[in-house]
Interface confidence: medium
Amino acid sequence: MRTFNYWKKRNVRGPEPVVFFGNLKDSALRKKNMGVVMEELYNMFPEEKVIGIYRMTSPCLLVRDLDVIKHIMIKDFEVFSDRGVEFSKEGLGSNLFHADGETWRALGNRFTPIFTSGKLKNMFYLMHEGADNFIDHVSAECEKNQEFEVHSLLQTYTMSTIAACAFGISYDSIGDKVKALDIVDKIISEPSYAIELDMMYPGLLSKLNLSIFPTVVKNFFKSLVDNIVAQRNGKPSGRNDFMDLILELRQLGEVTSNKYGSSASSLEITDEVICAQAFVFYIAGYETSATTMAYMIYQLALNPDIQNKLIAEVDEVLKANDGKVTYDTVKEMKYLNKAFDETLRMYSIVEPLQRKATRDYKIPGTDVVIEKDTIVLISPRGIHYDPKYYDNPKQFNPDRFDAEEVGKRHPCAYLPFGLGQRNCIGMRFGRLQSLLCITKILSKFRIEPSKNTDRNLQVEPHRGLIGPKGGIRVNAIPRKLVS
């Protein structure tokens, strides 16, 4: 067993590790979410630029200083283009999120065009249809009971939009949608200890060809892709959606990272690689947005004044546009966008951010030199709740995102989508589908706490992403019933 004196020898301060678990006992035992544990570690050493911690037995560096973060994520990105998540590249492993730096470059060059404004405008009508169906469903349910568990409810909307926009699938029956959701839920919630194993023995999963994803999930995405490939006769259909891009890549047979342009760094587009991208788009497009919207609705229920301002803005914009929600009206709603940003400040979904040094690297402004392959971690949650950057951080306040306020803050004080070249490729898609749905909800309903609303909402310890423990229960009151 490696000894826990790595950081002491290098004069880097940090919390005392525990045998076997390092500093991650609570997350390894699933008592606390990893993001919450990282926030606690961030808060332990308020004067330090970096903190030496141990993920299980592996030494890692938790970076607190915003200037150092800027170097890692932007200025010295070449050194930190890897996320440092190593497991089998088979079975969904070579997806865009988890891919090493080279694979990511090859794929990222191809997938970035999916999310241009033009493509998003084309997808908007599909999102719109999904949102209308969703509102119809909520209205019908409302007649029976006005209380909803909005997190799992909103997953039905985001599942529809990602299925329609990325894969051209229409989940006609709620039953089909629920079946798909139940399978996909397993990825996010089934406690796999493979990640802890990787922390203890970096590279072991890769060597043993182990995946972190359940077989049932792998099979679901394989059959999903096989069906779509068959439907489109293996060729792009002209829809210009995610699946068409995949089919173009399939015809090419390989993609090259333009860093070298040589076949040495090309990636063969096998059906396995295709499944891996389908998987990451599905997960990224569905869970993150559903969780963000659920938290936003929660905060609106608890902050009726803010909700009133939002409803007034929605009503005004809809009135000026003949009651229609368009791609442009969503962008126009300034306060709505600020409320969305504030939601992501309080509930950044992907925690912590992680990078791996591809060579030895001196941390700017310190004497610390980290060795090649060291994992560097950043806690968005720690930063977002740091009173140094945000006054009264536990209070939901969209005005923090007034242009002047944003201008006063360090560019790295807000990290819900990561930062730099390897930030979230789908952030504009996520914002659009979320704000469209919230607009539709607020145009029809007022959100109020129910008798079961948890006012001290905890983070679910079992999920890999940040999410509400026990869901979020609120009442949706049809606005025609509200004077």
Partner: nanobody, 119 residues
Framework: QVQLQESGGGLVQAGGSLTLSCAAS????????MGWFRQAPGKERELVAD????????YYSDSVKGRFTISRDNAKNTVYLEIDSLKPGDTAVYYC????????????WGQGTQVTVSS
């Protein structure tokens, strides 16, 4: 249709513990989550805990946090409610019910099982 059958109720001494079971049959794929409710004489029926089949998401009402534990066995299509440190105030008929994703309208109900706590 989803059929639900509770069992495990009975007469217990205060301070004791009890595990209630609820077996689901029929079209269980229609059910996203199962909730346990209780209704004491002359009182409204109240939700005490709820668990999702697919992701195990758990909800407890404030009144029972810490003493009640809900769990599921997907292979057996059964949900359990373990009650510790029973108090006379826990005397009630306990019902299990099933609901669809997102809604809190429980659409299928069991017959209920009586739990009586004697001091």
């Amino acid at each position: 249709q989803v059929q639900l059958q509770e069992s495990g109720g009975g007469l217990v001494q205060a301070g004791g513990s009890l595990t209630l079971s609820c077996a689901a049959s029929g079209r269980t794929s229609r059910s996203y989550a199962m909730g346990w409710f209780r209704q004491a004489p002359g009182k409204e029926r109240e939700l005490v805990a709820d668990i999702a089949w697919s992701d195990g998401r758990i909800y407890y009402s404030d009144s029972v946090k810490g003493r009640f534990t809900i769990s599921r066995d997907n292979a057996k299509n059964t949900v359990y409610l373990e009650i510790d440190s029973l108090k006379p105030g826990d005397t009630a008929v306990y019902y299990c019910a099933s609901r669809a994703r997102g809604t809190v309208s429980y659409n299928y109900w069991g017959q209920g099982t009586q739990v009586t706590v004697s001091s």
